[in-house]
C-alpha cells in the first residue's frame, strides 16, 4: 500500500513572495499543496483541515490559526476554528471560504491543506428475519481468555451497549463527531442509528457470535445515523484514541475503522501516525468494486486493510458494487450474510454484509492473537495474519484482469494455536503503484518500518521495462522498477520480511563485457544471498545465448544477462540459511513456477535470462512466479526458454528460540 | 435472478388517482434505494422520484411534487407510486429502477423493470 | 426541458467508434457521479456506465465513459449493429435534489 497515490486530485499553489505582513515567511521557494477528494459528491467544501509540518509545536498551531483568522477579517471574510490538532498531527480544521484557500497556504508552517469529505459505513443490512446466533465451531482454536487483554476500539454510529451480545463488554466513551443527517424528514430512530455499531461491536467481541469473546470494546461515534461521517470527524477520532493512549496506556490496541472515503492524505497520515505509535488499525477496503487504493483509511500502508468474501471464498457482490480489491487489501475476511447483533431489540440478531463486517472478523482475529502474544509489533501481526491466511481460494475471475495479479488470494484464519509460530520466516509480497507510462517512469515498492527487503522484482504486461534495483532511500532500501520506451508501465514487488538483528546490504556487479554474462556474489563471511535482482539501460535486451547458467557449488551468486546490472541482496542474521531452487522450462510458456518446500520460505524470485519476452517475476506466498509473453507471439525458439528461479531461506536461530520457549 | 414488475398501470381521467406497484426478488429489497423513471411516448427519460432503502428520504421531480407519494414496504419487497391529481401530461410508461448502492443515492439505477403505462385521458 | 444537453443522434459504419457527449454543470455533472444508459428499441434502459467510468460485470469494454469538468462522454469502439439504440446520460443534480437525465442521443449503424 502506497499512500501517496490514489486517483487524488491535488492543486498546487506556489508560495508567492509577498508575504502580507507575516511575523515568519516560511522558507523561500517551498510550496504548499492543497488536495481534495476526488469523488465529486463526497466533497465537503467549506471545512478544510490544515496540515502544519512535523514538527510544529501546539502554541505554533494555535498561532497559525490565529493569524489565518486575522488575514481573513481584514478581506472581510468570516472564519471559525473548529479544532485544534495536536498528539497525531499537528494542524487545525477551519470552516471558510474556499477564496481564502490561497492564502492559507501562504501561511507559516504549513505543509499542505485538505478539504474535508464524507465517509461512509460500509456494510448493508440483509435478511430481514431474526436469526439464532452460531458459535464458533469447537475445533477452531479459542485462546482460554478470547482476546482478554487487547483493547478494540471502534470508530463507528452509536451503539447499543445494553444489547446482551455485548453488554459489559463495550464502554461507550463520550466521543462525538458526526454530520447532521440528508434530508428533511429524516427521524433519529435509536435502533436506526445503533445499527451498524451494535452488529461490529457483536462481530468482534460478541457472547455468541463474536471472534474475540474475551476482547473489551470502546466505541466513538464518528457515523451518524444514515453511516455517515466526514474524515475530520475520523481524524479527531484517531486524536482521541492516542491522547487516551498516552494518558493512561494499556495493552495493546486495536483500532476497527469499518468506514471508507476517498482517498485522503491527511487521514492515511493521522493512520500511519497511530500505527507508529504501536496502535494496530485495520479498517474496510470498501464496497466499491473498484481499486482500495482509490479510497482511505484503506489505502494507508501501515493500516491492515480487509476485503469481503462468501462463505464460498468468492468475493462478495453487492449488486452491481462488491467488495474492493488490488494492492491495497491485505487479505480477505468472511463479509457476506454476517450475523451479528441487531439494534431492534436487546436480544435480536441481523445479518449484515459487506467489508466492514470482514474488517470486524480480522479485527477478533488480530485481539486473540495480541492477546496471546501482547508484544507483537503491527508487522509481526501482519505477518502472521497473512501467513495463517486460507491460500488460493478466491476465484480470482471476479476481479478486473489487471488487478489479478495485484489483489492477495488470502482468507483471514484464526491461526491453529498462537505455539510454533515463532521459528517460522515470516516474508509478504508488496506491489508498488503502477509508474505510469513515461519512458523514465519507475516505481517504487517498500516494506514497512520494521521489515526487511530481501530482494525485488519488476513486471510489465507490456513486457517493455528495465529491470529493477534495490536501492537506499531514507536509511531504508527499496525496490525501484524502471519502465522502458514504448512500456505501458511498471510494478516494483518487494519481499518484505520479518528478520530480527538482520544486517543486508546490495551487492552490485556492472554489465558484463564477456559473452557468458553478469555476476555478483555474496562475499562477506557470513553474509547469504537472499535475492537477485536485474537492472539494464537498454530498451530491448536482446536473446542471451548461451544461457546463462549457474554454477555448481555456488548458490551464493546471481547471474543475469551480460548487458544488465545485477544485484544482489546480501543479508547475515542469525542461524539464516539459504538455497537457490531453480525450475527451467526448455519449450516457451506463459508462466514457470517454482515454490519453497516446507519448513523454508520463500525471500526471492527472479527469471532467467532476463530477456524482453519475459514480463517479470514475483512471489506469490511461497511460490516464486515467472510470466512471459503470449506463446503465440514467441514462438518456440530457445528465446521461449525461462528459468524461475527462487531464494529459499529458514532461520535455525528462530527454530532454536521458539524451541527455548516451549 | 433479479427482477423488477411494475403493476397497476392503466387509463385513467385526468384528476384521478393511481397508484402503482413494484415487486421486487432476486435481491435484498431493503437494502438499496429505489427510483421511479418514466418515459412519456416518442420522448427521453424523465426521472420520477427516489426513496432510500429505510424509506428515510425521499425525492421527487417539481413537476409531481405534493401530486405523488412514493413508499415501499420492506416486510413486502415492494415499491409503490400514489399519483394522485393526474394529468395528461403523466401519461407514460413507468419503469421502476434500483439504486446501484445503499447511502449513495446519486450513483443512478442498476436493475430496471419492463415497464407499466400509464394513460391519462379523457 | 432537459438540464443535460446531448446530440440528437450520431451515426458510424460497423467497426468505427462514435463519441456521445453530456453536457451539464457544476450542480449536476460538475460535481455528482455520471452514469449512461442504453435503451434499445421497445425495451428498458439498461446501465452501461456508473462513477462516470466503470462499466458494470457483463458490459463489454468497447463501452466507456469519462468525465471532465461539467462535461461526460461515452465512446463506442467497434461499433456494431446490435448497439443501435437511444443512449441516456443521467446523475444527480444537487441544487434540483433530483435525478437528471439527458434529452438522450440515437445511434445509428450505417
Known amino acids: 500500500q502506497e499512500d501517496e497515490d490514489g486517483d487524488y486530485e491535488e492543486l498546487v499553489l506556489a508560495l508567492r513572495s509577498e508575504e502580507d505582513g507575516l511575523a515568519e515567511a516560511p522558507e523561500h521557494g517551498t510550496t504548499a499543496t492543497f488536495h481534495r477528494c476526488a469523488k465529486d459528491p463526497w466533497r465537503l467544501p467549506g471545512t478544510y483541515v490544515v496540515v502544519l509540518k512535523e514538527e510544529t509545536h501546539l502554541s505554533q498551531s494555535e498561532r497559525t490559526a490565529r493569524r489565518l483568522q486575522a488575514q481573513a477579517a481584514r478581506r472581510g471574510y468570516l472564519t471559525k476554528i473548529l479544532h485544534v490538532f495536536h498528539g497525531l498531527l499537528p494542524g487545525f480544521l477551519v470552516k471558510m471560504s474556499g477564496d481564502l484557500l490561497e492564502l492559507a497556504l501562504k501561511l507559516p508552517h504549513v505543509d499542505y491543506i485538505e478539504e474535508d469529505s464524507s465517509v461512509f459505513a460500509q456494510s448493508i443490512p440483509w435478511n430481514l428475519e431474526r436469526i439464532t446466533p452460531p458459535r464458533y465451531r469447537a475445533d477452531e482454536y479459542q485462546p482460554p481468555d478470547g482476546g482478554s487483554l487487547v483493547e478494540v476500539y471502534l470508530l463507528d454510529t452509536s451503539i447499543q451497549s445494553d444489547h446482551r451480545e455485548i453488554e459489559g463488554r463495550v464502554m461507550v466513551t463520550d466521543f462525538e463527531n458526526v454530520p447532521e443527517e440528508d434530508g428533511t424528514r429524516f427521524h433519529r430512530q435509536a435502533s436506526k442509528c445503533d445499527s451498524h455499531g451494535t452488529h461490529l461491536a457483536g462481530v468482534v467481541s460478541g457472547r455468541d457470535a463474536g471472534v474475540a469473546k474475551g476482547a473489551s470494546m470502546r466505541s466513538l461515534r464518528v457515523l451518524n445515523c444514515q453511516g455517515k461521517g466526514t474524515v475530520s470527524g475520523t481524524l479527531i477520532g484517531l486524536e482521541f484514541i492516542r491522547k487516551s493512549q498516552l494518558v493512561q496506556p494499556v495493552g495493546p490496541l486495536v483500532v476497527l475503522l469499518p468506514l471508507a472515503g476517498g482517498y485522503s492524505r491527511v487521514l492515511n497520515a493521522a493512520c500511519q501516525r497511530l500505527a507508529r505509535a504501536g496502535v494496530v488499525l485495520v479498517t474496510a477496503a470498501g464496497n466499491f468494486r473498484d481499486d482500495a487504493c482509490l479510497y482511505s483509511p484503506a489505502s494507508a500502508p501501515e493500516v491492515i486493510t480487509v476485503g469481503a468474501t462468501n462463505a464460498q471464498d468468492q468475493p462478495v457482490t453487492l449488486g452491481t458494487l462488491g467488495t474492493n480489491f488490488g494492492r491495497c487489501v491485505d487479505l480477505f475476511a468472511p463479509g457476506e450474510d454476517i450475523i451479528g447483533a441487531s439494534s431492534d431489540c436487546s436480544t435480536c440478531f441481523v445479518s449484515q454484509s459487506g467489508t466492514s463486517q470482514a474488517a470486524a472478523h480480522v479485527a477478533g482475529i488480530a485481539a486473540m492473537m495480541l492477546s496471546a502474544e501482547p508484544e507483537l509489533t503491527l508487522a509481526e501481526l501482519r505477518q502472521r495474519l497473512i501467513h495463517f491466511s486460507a491460500k488460493d481460494v478466491i476465484n480470482e475471475a471476479w476481479f478486473p484482469e489487471d488487478q489479478r495479479v495485484l489483489t492477495p488470494n488470502l482468507v483471514a484464519a484464526l491461526p491453529p494455536s498462537t505455539h510454533g509460530a515463532g521459528w517460522q520466516l515470516f516474508c509478504r509480497t508488496v506491489w508498488s503503484a503502477h509508474s505510469g507510462p513515461t519512458r523514465m517512469a519507475t516505481a517504487v515498492a517498500r516494506c514497512a518500518p520494521d521489515e526487511e527487503l530481501l530482494s525485488c522484482s519488476s513486471f510489465s504486461r507490456s513486457g517493455k521495462r528495465r529491470g529493477e534495483r534495490m536501492e537506499a532511500q531514507g536509511g531504508k532500501l527499496v525496490c525501484r522498477a524502471h519502465n522502458a520506451f514504448g512500456g505501458e508501465g511498471v510494478y516494483a514487488i518487494a519481499r518484505c520480511c520479518l528478520l530480527p538483528q538482520a544486517n543486508c546490504s546490495v551487492h552490485t556487479a556492472p554489465p558484463a563485457e564477456a559473452s557468458m554474462g553478469t555476476r555478483v556474489h555474496c562475499h562477506q563471511q557470513g553474509h547469504v544471498l537472499t535475492g537477485c535482482s536485474s537492472h539494464w539501460e537498454v530498451e530491448d535486451l536482446g536473446t542471451h545465448k548461451p544461457p546463462v547458467l549457474r554454477p555448481r557449488g555456488q548458490p551464493n551468486q546471481c547471474v543475469g544477462h551480460r548487458e544488465a546490472s545485477i544485484h544482489a541482496s546480501c543479508c547475515h542474521a542469525p542461524g539464516l540459511e539459504c538455497k537457490v531452487k531453480e525450475h527451467g522450462i526448455p519449450a516457451p510458456q506463459e508462466q514457470v513456477t517454482v515454490a519453497c518446500e516446507e519448513g523454508w520460505t520463500l525471500t526471492g524470485c527472479s527469471a532467467l535470462p532476463g530477456t524482453s519476452h519475459v514480463l517479470g517475476a514475483y512471489a506469490v506466498d511461497n511460490t516464486c512466479v515467472v510470466r512471459s509473453r503470449d506463446v503465440s507471439t514467441t514462438g518456440s525458439t530457445s528465446e521461449g526458454a525461462v528459468t524461475a528461479v527462487a531464494i529459499c531461506c529458514r532461520s535455525r536461530h528462530l527454530a532454536q528460540a521458539s524451541q527455548e520457549l516451549q | 435472478q433479479v427482477q423488477l414488475v411494475e403493476s397497476g398501470g392503466g387509463v385513467v381521467q385526468p384528476g384521478r388517482s393511481l397508484r402503482l406497484s413494484c415487486a421486487a426478488s432476486?435481491?435484498?429489497?431493503?437494502?438499496?434505494?429505489m427510483h421511479w423513471v418514466r418515459q412519456a411516448p416518442g420522448k427521453g427519460l424523465e426521472w420520477v422520484a427516489l426513496i432510500w432503502h429505510d424509506g428515510s428520504n425521499t425525492y421527487y421531480v417539481d413537476s409531481v411534487k405534493g401530486r405523488f407519494t412514493i413508499s415501499r414496504d420492506n416486510s413486502k419487497n415492494t415499491l409503490y407510486l400514489q399519483m394522485n391529481s393526474l394529468r395528461a401530461e403523466d401519461t407514460a410508461v413507468y419503469y421502476c429502477?434500483?439504486?446501484?448502492?445503499?447511502?449513495?443515492?446519486?450513483?443512478?439505477?442498476?436493475?430496471w423493470g419492463q415497464g407499466t403505462t400509464v394513460t391519462v385521458s379523457s | 426541458q432537459s438540464v443535460l444537453t446531448q446530440p440528437p443522434s450520431v451515426s458510424a459504419a460497423p467497426g468505427q467508434k462514435v463519441t456521445i457527449s453530456c453536457s451539464g454543470s457544476?450542480?449536476?455533472?460538475?460535481?455528482?457521479?455520471v452514469s449512461w444508459y442504453q435503451q434499445l428499441p421497445g425495451t428498458a434502459p439498461k446501465l452501461l456506465i456508473y462513477d462516470s467510468n466503470k462499466r458494470p460485470s457483463g458490459i463489454p469494454d468497447r463501452f466507456s465513459g469519462s468525465k471532465s469538468g461539467t462535461s461526460a462522454t461515452l465512446d463506442i469502439t467497434g461499433l456494431q449493429t446490435g448497439d443501435e439504440a437511444d443512449y441516456y446520460c443521467?446523475?444527480?443534480?444537487?441544487?434540483?435534489?433530483?435525478?437528471?437525465f439527458g434529452t438522450g442521443t440515437k445511434v445509428t449503424v450505417l
Open positions: 432476486g435481491f435484498t429489497f431493503r437494502s438499496y434505494g
Open positions: 429502477a434500483r439504486g446501484i448502492a445503499v447511502a449513495y443515492y446519486y450513483y443512478g439505477m442498476d436493475v
Open positions: 457544476s450542480s449536476n455533472i460538475g460535481n455528482n457521479f
Open positions: 443521467g446523475t444527480w443534480d444537487s441544487s434540483l435534489s433530483a435525478y437528471v
